[in-house]
Interface confidence: medium
C-alpha cells in the first residue's frame, strides 16, 4: 500500500477518507488504528457500529469519529481539534473475523503556519489578505508521499 | 511603535525555577499568537513554546525539551506573555526572545544556568 | 522533526555582487492551499533576528527588493541580487509548516 499524506490545522478538524470496494468489503465493519512504530501493531482508535447496517452512524471514541458509507464505497474519519500529537501513521481497515485488510495507509500532518491566524485588517504585508478570507474554515490536504520522504525517520 | 520587552532572565542553578516576563505595547496583543524562541550562543534559535490566542482557546505548544517543565501563559489584560521555567538544565542556558515568530522580536534576556 | 540544512555556512562577497544562499528540507514544506511554510530570517550581530522572507518567495514589509526566495517543496534559495554592508550578518531558514518549528543552522555572510 502507498501512503497517502493527510494534512490539517492545528485546533480544527480534519476529515480523512478512504474509499473501498464496496462489493468486496460488503458485511465488514471497518476500523481506524494507529501504526506504533514501523513495524509495530496498529492500535486501534475506533471502529463502526457492531450491526454493519447502522454503519452509517457516527461513533466517537475521544475526539475521533468514524462512519462508513457502504454503497459508496467511503470510509470516513474526523479528527476534531487537531493537535501535534495525532501528526503519525495511520490505517483504515476492513474488519474479517479476527482479520483485518488495510484499506489505505495514512500519514496525518499536523499543520500550524502563524501567519494562517492573521486578520485581513491587521496586516503587515502587503498584498497578502486573499491568504486570510478562509482562515478560520477546516481545511484538509491529501497526496502521496514525495519519493525520498518516509513516515517514520530513523530512529538515532 | 511595536515594543516587546523581556524580563526575568538571570543566573540560576541547575534544578532551580526562573519566571520569564515579555510585556508588550503597539500592536493589537489579544489576536497575535506568540512565541518563546531560545538561542544558545554561536548557535541557531530553537522554538520553545506558543500560546495562541483568547479565540482559540489559549491552546498552548510545546518543544519536547521543555514539554512538562517549561508552562507558557498570557495575560490580555497587560499584554503581556509568560515563561514558567521549572527544573533548569544546564542545556536551557540561551538568550529568551518573545516573539509572534514573524515580524514582532523583542530585544532577549539571558538565562544562565551553571552551578 | 522538520530538518533543515543550509549550505554554504559561510560566504564572503564584495560589496555589489551577488550572494546566494541555500536551505534544504527533509520533509515537504508544501501545505494547505499550496502555501509553502518557508521563511527567510537575518540576523544582525547582536540584533534579534528580522523576517526577511515569508511563505517562500514573498518580501515582508520594509525588505529590499534586492532580496528574493524561491524554491520547490524541499529545496529553497534566498538570493541577494547586490549586497550592500548593511547585510552582513547570519541568514536562518525556517519552517513553520509544523511542529516543532525549526530553523536551520545559519549562514554567515561577511564581505570581503
Known amino acids: 500500500h502507498n501512503t497517502t499524506v493527510f494534512q490539517g490545522v492545528a485546533g480544527q478538524s480534519l476529515q480523512v477518507s478512504c474509499p473501498y470496494d464496496s462489493m468486496k468489503h460488503w458485511g465488514r465493519r471497518k476500523a481506524w488504528c494507529r501504526q506504533l512504530g514501523e513495524k509495530g501493531p496498529c492500535q486501534r482508535v475506533v471502529s463502526t457500529h457492531n450491526l454493519w447496517l447502522l454503519s452509517f452512524l457516527r461513533r466517537w471514541n475521544g475526539s475521533t469519529a468514524i462512519t462508513d458509507d457502504t454503497l459508496g464505497g467511503t470510509l470516513t474519519i474526523t479528527l476534531r481539534n487537531l493537535q501535534p500529537h495525532d501528526a503519525g501513521l495511520y490505517q483504515c481497515q476492513s474488519l474479517h473475523g479476527s482479520e483485518a485488510d488495510t484499506l489505505r495507509k495514512v500519514l496525518v500532518e499536523v499543520l500550524a503556519d502563524p501567519l494562517d491566524h492573521r486578520d485581513a485588517g491587521d496586516l503587515w504585508f502587503p498584498g497578502e489578505s486573499e491568504s486570510f478570507e478562509d482562515a478560520h474554515v477546516e481545511h484538509s490536504i491529501s497526496r502521496s508521499l514525495l519519493e525520498g520522504e518516509i513516515p517514520f525517520p530513523p530512529t538515532s | 511603535e511595536v515594543q516587546l520587552v523581556e524580563t526575568g532572565g538571570s543566573l540560576v542553578q541547575p534544578g532551580k525555577s526562573l519566571r520569564l516576563t515579555c510585556a508588550t505595547s503597539g500592536f493589537p496583543f489579544s489576536n497575535v499568537w506568540l512565541h518563546w524562541v531560545r538561542q544558545s550562543p554561536e548557535k541557531h534559535p530553537e522554538w520553545v513554546a506558543h500560546?495562541?490566542?483568547?479565540?482559540?482557546?489559549?491552546?498552548?505548544y510545546y518543544a519536547e525539551s521543555v514539554k512538562g517543565r517549561f508552562t507558557i501563559s498570557r495575560d490580555d489584560s497587560k499584554s503581556s506573555v509568560f515563561l514558567q521555567m521549572n527544573s533548569l538544565k544546564e542545556e536551557d542556558t540561551a538568550i529568551y526572545y518573545c516573539?509572534?515568530?514573524?515580524?514582532?522580536w523583542g530585544q532577549g534576556t539571558l538565562v544562565t544556568v551553571s552551578s | 522533526d522538520t530538518v533543515l540544512t543550509q549550505a554554504p555556512l559561510s560566504v564572503s562577497v564584495t560589496p555589489g555582487e551577488s550572494a546566494s544562499i541555500s536551505c534544504r528540507s527533509n520533509?515537504?514544506?508544501?501545505?494547505?492551499?499550496?502555501?509553502?511554510?518557508l521563511y527567510w530570517f537575518l540576523q544582525k550581530p547582536g540584533k534579534s533576528p528580522q523576517l526577511l522572507i515569508y511563505?517562500?518567495?514573498n518580501l515582508a514589509s520594509g525588505v529590499p527588493d534586492r532580496f528574493s526566495g524561491s524554491g520547490s517543496e524541499t529545496d529553497f534559495t534566498l538570493k541577494i541580487s547586490e549586497v550592500e554592508t548593511e547585510d552582513v550578518g547570519v541568514y536562518y531558514c525556517a519552517q513553520f509548516l509544523r511542529y516543532p518549528y525549526t530553523f536551520g543552522p545559519g549562514t554567515k555572510l561577511e564581505l570581503q
Open positions: 516573539t509572534d515568530i514573524l515580524e514582532y
Open positions: 511563505r517562500m518567495s
Open positions: 520533509k515537504s514544506l508544501l501545505g494547505i492551499r499550496d502555501i509553502t511554510s
Open positions: 500560546i495562541k490566542a483568547k479565540s482559540d482557546n489559549y491552546a498552548t
